[in-house]
Amino acid sequence: AFGISGVQKYTRALHDSSITGISPITEYLASLSTYNDQSITFALEDESYEIYVEDLKKDEKKDKVLLSYYESQHPSNESGDGVDGKMLMVTLSPTKDFWLHANNKEHSVELHKCEKPLPDQAFFVLHNMHSNCVSFECKTDPGVFIGVKDNHLALIKVDSSENLCTENILFKLSET
C-alpha cells in the first residue's frame, strides 16, 4: 500500500490554482522543528518511512528536508474562496524520491515515493508567520494545515483565518 497508487485522488485543488512552470524557483535544505522546538524526524521502518515529532538529545543530528519552492498564480475570478494573486508553494522531501503527502481522508501526513510530476497532495501553500515560523496549507484542501497531534504530524483543519497562529501548526526552518 506504499507508493503513488496509495495516494488518494482528490479533485478539489486549492483555489483552482495553477503552479507556474514545472521546475522550482528555488530549493532550500533545512531541518524542520515545531514551535516548541521539537524535531521532525524520519525513520525507515519495514520498507516505509515513519514521521516522528520528538525531543532530540543534545548534539544529536537533525534530519534535513529539501524544500522546493514553486510560484502559484490564483486569478480572483476563478477562486471561489476569495483568495487571489501570487503565492509560494512548497514540496518537502526528506530523502531522494520521497515526499510528504497530505492524506485528507485519514487526516494524516505521510511519506510517499513517487515520480515527477508530483501529485497535488505533495504541494503546500507556505505561510510566512510571526516569530520566524511558517505554516503549511494543503493545496488539495484549503484551510487544512500540517500540524502536530500526539507527537505525530497530522492534518489540522483551521476553522477560521484568525486561528492561523495556533502553535500546533507553526514550524521553524533552520539550516543547522
Epitope: T26, V83, D84, G85, K86, L88, L126, V134, L164, C165
Partner: antibody, heavy 121, light 111 residues
Amino acid sequence: EVQLVESGGGLVQPGGSLRLSCAASGFTFNKFWMNWVRQAPGKGLEWVAEIRLSSINYVKDYAESVKGRFTISRDNAKNSVYLQMNSLRAEDTAVYYCIRRNYGNWFFEIWGQGTLVTVSS
Amino acid sequence: DIQMTQSPSSLSASVGDRVTITCRASESVDRYGISFMNWFQQKPGKAPKLLIYAASNQGSGVPSRFSGSGSGTDFTLTISSLQPEDFATYYCQHSKEVPYTFGQGTKVEIK
C-alpha cells in the same frame, strides 16, 4: 475585482487627530495581513504599521516614528482596516496607502489609491 | 533595522535602452532560502505597483522585460528594453521583518 479604497484624509492642525479607513472588496479580507505605508510630498515610501491575524489579539507592529501615536485596527465583519492618528505633527503630512500582503504573507501585493493627510496650522 | 540603499537616485535613458538599478541591504534579507526583496514601480500621482517579489519573481501582469536578481544583500532590477510607459520611479523594499524599509527610489527619466 480586488480593491482597497482609503478615506478619512484631510487637513488637521498639529496635535490633532484623524482616523483613516480602508474598505476592502473582491477578496476574503480576514485571510490577509494589512499594512499602511505613507509618502510625504515629493519623498519616498515609509512603512507605517501592520496588523496580522490571531485568535487572541491581532498582532500589530509600528514604525518607530509613529509608535505611541498611531493605532492600527481591523474589523473583519466590515472588511475594513483603520489607522487612528493622534498627536499629529507636520512631518506626518503624506499620502497614506492601505496595502494587502499576498496570501501567505511574503510581500506587499495590492495597494489602494491613497488618501492625503495634511497637518498644518 | 535593515537599511536599503538604492542606486542611482536618478538616470536618463532612451526607449529601447537596457536599464539596471541596484539595491543593497545593510544585512541579509534572506530567510528560509527566500530573499525577502521586492521592487515597485510608481508613476506620478499613482500608487506603487508590485513588479518583482522574492528577488526574481514577477508580480501579476508585469511585462517580461522586467527582471530581478540577487540574494543576501545585493539585488538588481533590470528593464531589458525600456518602453515609454516605463518612465517612473522605482523602489526596492525588504519584507523580511519589521520595520519594512524601502530604498530612496530611482527616477528613470527620458533622455
